[in-house]
Structures are given as C-alpha cells and as structure tokens.
C-alpha cells in the first residue's frame, strides 16, 4: 500500500505518457488522477512500467471502481490484466468478444492462469452458451480449452459451434467429454457427403456408439489406427471381423502391432479365431473353433 502524500509541485500528470516511468510509486499515487488513468488506459499498455508501478495504477482503478471496472476500461487493461485477481474479475461484466481477445492476447504463450479461467467463465456465463465465435477465439489461444470443460459444461455447446473445433482441440479430451461432443458433431456435419463427413467427424469418434461405427464401415472410410485406438471399447467389441476390416481398409494391418492394447486386445478375445485368421495377420487369442459363444449381456437383459 502506497502512503497518501501530496504531489510535488510541477509533477501532476496532465496525461498518461512515458514520463511517468520515472515516477516513484508514491508519486504515481499522488500525481496521477484515477479518472484520467481510466480514460487513457489504452496508453498504459505501450509504456514500460515496472511490475511495481502497475500495482499503483491498479490500486487507483480499484478506488475509482470499487464495484468492478467498466468494460471500456477492461478492454484496454493490457498488461495490467496480469495484476488482477480472480476476485477482481468476478466483479466484471465482459460482453464483448473484442475485450476477451484483448485480454487473452496479454496472456498469450502462457498456461491458462486462474485469472484467465475466471475471465472465460464470466464471459461464457454472460453469453449463456459457448457460441462458435467464442469457441473459435478460445481454442485459438488455448487448444486444450474444450477438454478442460466438464461434460456438464460441454452440454451447453450448441452443435453450430462444433464447426470451430480443430482436431488438436480434442487431443486431451477423455471419453466422457467425447460422449457429449460426438452427438453434437454428428448433428453439425450431418449434411456433408461421406468422405468429407468422415474427415470432420473423425476426431470426435471416441464418443461414437457401435451402430455408427457399423455404418461407417459401409462407407470405405479407411480409418487410421490412431483413431481406431481412441474408440470406446464397448463400441468396438460388437463389431465383426468383416466390419473392422472394412472400417480400417488398408490400415487393418496395423492391428497386429496393437494386439496387446485396448480396444484391439478386448476385441480379439470376442472374435472367433477362424474369422481372425481370414485377416492373415497372425492375430491370436480369439475364441477357438467349436466353442459356443454366449452373449451374457443379452441374457441379463432378458432376465
């Protein structure tokens, strides 16, 4: 906290300019008018203040706006944003995407801080949903943003926003998140033709049910092994050898290298060895010939 002292003669700041970098903290406190600072916030970002000097400028704004800063000030905070606490940010009402972009730009290249997380939360809650433009912006700055949301939060993403999602945005998503996103993607891309549809839907397939995988197997999609390995085990298990062969196309040979890993390992255990042998890959561990396969899940459903 900087003591209240009178401004020395001739040091009262008529405007926010670079001469202020020579001011000590107490001089900034005494000689810079808070209302002037608020109207000339855009200049602060171009002046190489020290971190300590920014503390004083923040303190002046806090005194001027105890209920939270107006958006006209927030948009021009620049590096002063790094001084804000999540508690400060919770007082704000940020509605403009331009304001959001300006503040994310300040934090660019760094991990998502608690301040940024709070800002995004306030912004999205203010909008009521995660619309396409917002999602576009957030994933541009934080490719992992989507996967940081809970399945409940993801449920507020409208299908139209899915067009903004890039494959790398889903890299860290877990199956529960993809379960929520996949139906939205399916809806968003439903009017695309087969090959274009597959390109778009591919990164969401970790949430696809068995029936959709069966449908894809009829469309010559040639799914790569990396995508196949991310599919839900429970969705892969009911697929026949013929369906998996059609689904993977020329990539089917990759099954051999993955035969000890899920979901391939579990899928192999469910197939007849005879059927696996038709692939000519030397996959082992299928059900020996002559054994009766009981579908216990079906039996449980009937009882």
């Amino acid at each position: 906290e900087v003591e209240k002292t009178a401004c020395p003669s001739g040091k009262k700041a008529p405007e926010i300019d670079e001469s202020l970098i020579f001011y000590k903290k107490w001089e900034l406190e005494a000689c810079v008018d808070a209302a002037l600072l608020a109207t000339q916030m855009d200049r602060v970002n171009a002046i190489p203040f020290t971190y300590e000097q920014l503390d004083v400028l923040k303190h002046k704004l806090d005194e001027l706006y105890p209920q939270g800063y107006p958006e006209s000030v927030i948009q021009h905070l620049g590096y002063l944003f790094l001084k804000m606490s999540p508690e400060d940010i919770r007082k704000w009402n940020v509605t403009s995407l331009e304001t959001l972009k300006a503040l994310l730009e300040v934090n660019k290249g760094h991990e998502m801080s608690p301040q940024v997380a709070t800002l995004i939360d306030r912004f999205v809650k203010g909008r009521g949903q995660l619309d396409k433009d917002t999602l576009d912006t957030l994933t541009a700055f934080y490719p992992g943003y989507l996967c940081s949301l809970s399945p409940e939060e993801l449920s507020s993403v409208p299908p139209s926003s899915i067009w903004a999602v890039r494959p790398q945005d889903l890299d860290t998503c877990d199956p529960r998140q993809l379960d929520v996103l996949y139906p939205k993607a399916r809806l968003a891309f439903q009017n695309m033709n087969g090959s274009e549809y597959f390109v778009k839907i591919q990164s969401f397939l970790g949430g696809a049910p068995t029936e959709d995988l069966k449908a894809l197997s009829q469309q010559n999609v040639s799914m790569d092994l990396a995508t196949f390995m991310k599919l839900r085990t429970d969705a892969v298990l009911p697929l026949t050898v013929a369906e998996v062969q059609k689904l993977l196309g020329p990539h089917v040979e990759g099954l051999k290298a993955e035969e000890r890993h899920r979901p391939v390992r579990d899928w192999i255990l469910r197939q007849r060895q005879d059927d696996l042998d038709t692939l000519g890959l030397g996959l082992q561990g299928g059900i020996p010939n002559g054994y009766l396969v009981l579908d216990l899940s079906m039996q449980e459903a009937l009882s």
Partner: nanobody
Framework: QVQLVESGGGLVQAGGSLRLSCTAS????????MGWYRQEAPGKERELVA????????NYADSVKGRFTISRDNAKNTVYLQMNSLKSEDTGVYYC?????????WGQGTQVTVSS
C-alpha cells in the same frame, strides 16, 4: 528469454566515478529501448535513473541529471552508465532492463557503494 549481465560496480569515494556495463545475449539488441534502475536496499522500490532508446535519445531522473550519462554500443550489445560526481545517496544495486511493456525480467545487478 534475453539474459542481461551487469558489471562495473564497486566501492568508490564520494565525488568519484564509475562506469557500469550491461551486456545482452540478444542479437536484435539495437532495437531495444534500455534503462538503468537503482535499488537502494533489498525490498525497496527500483527507481529508474536513465533510459536510452533505439535512436540514442536519452532521459534521466532529476536526481542524476548532469552527473550520469547513458550510452550504448550496438555492435557489442552493451549499454553503459557513466556515473560522475557520485554521492552517498547513489549507493545501491544497479540493474539494467529492456524497456519493453510486459517485460519484467532483471539481471543480477551490480552493487555500487559510495562512501563519504
């Protein structure tokens, strides 16, 4: 991150002179706007004493005007602070800084002690 290394500090009698140097590891050094700061004691505020921009234009704190001169040698990636007529109140650790908004990295500093 650009490394800044300050040197040239030491113990000097009041009225004496010292020349501080700050060398940067960055090749695009000539484009940088540079400043020298003084910190009287640990925990106290760093005060800006002099700046020099890319065109060689300089500015000084009132307390050092006429006594200190800041200069630069872009070929050597170095900025200097020539300190004459030193006073006991000039004692402190001197740091150079790349005067870039949002840049708050400092070198290790060089101690200047002026005895009266």
């Amino acid at each position: 991150q650009v490394q800044l290394v300050e040197s040239g500090g030491g113990l000097v009698q009041a009225g004496g002179s010292l020349r501080l140097s700050c060398t940067a590891s960055e090749s695009g050094f000539s484009a940088n706007y540079m400043g020298w700061y003084r910190q009287e004691a640990p925990g106290k505020e760093r005060e800006l004493v002099a700046t020099i921009n890319r065109f060689g234009s300089t500015n000084y704190a009132d307390s050092v005007k006429g006594r200190f001169t800041i200069s630069r040698d872009n070929a050597k990636n170095t900025v200097y602070l020539q300190m004459n007529s030193l006073k006991s109140e000039d004692t402190g650790v001197y740091y150079c800084r790349i005067m870039r908004p949002g840049n708050w990295y400092w070198g290790q500093g060089t101690q200047v002690t002026v005895s009266s």
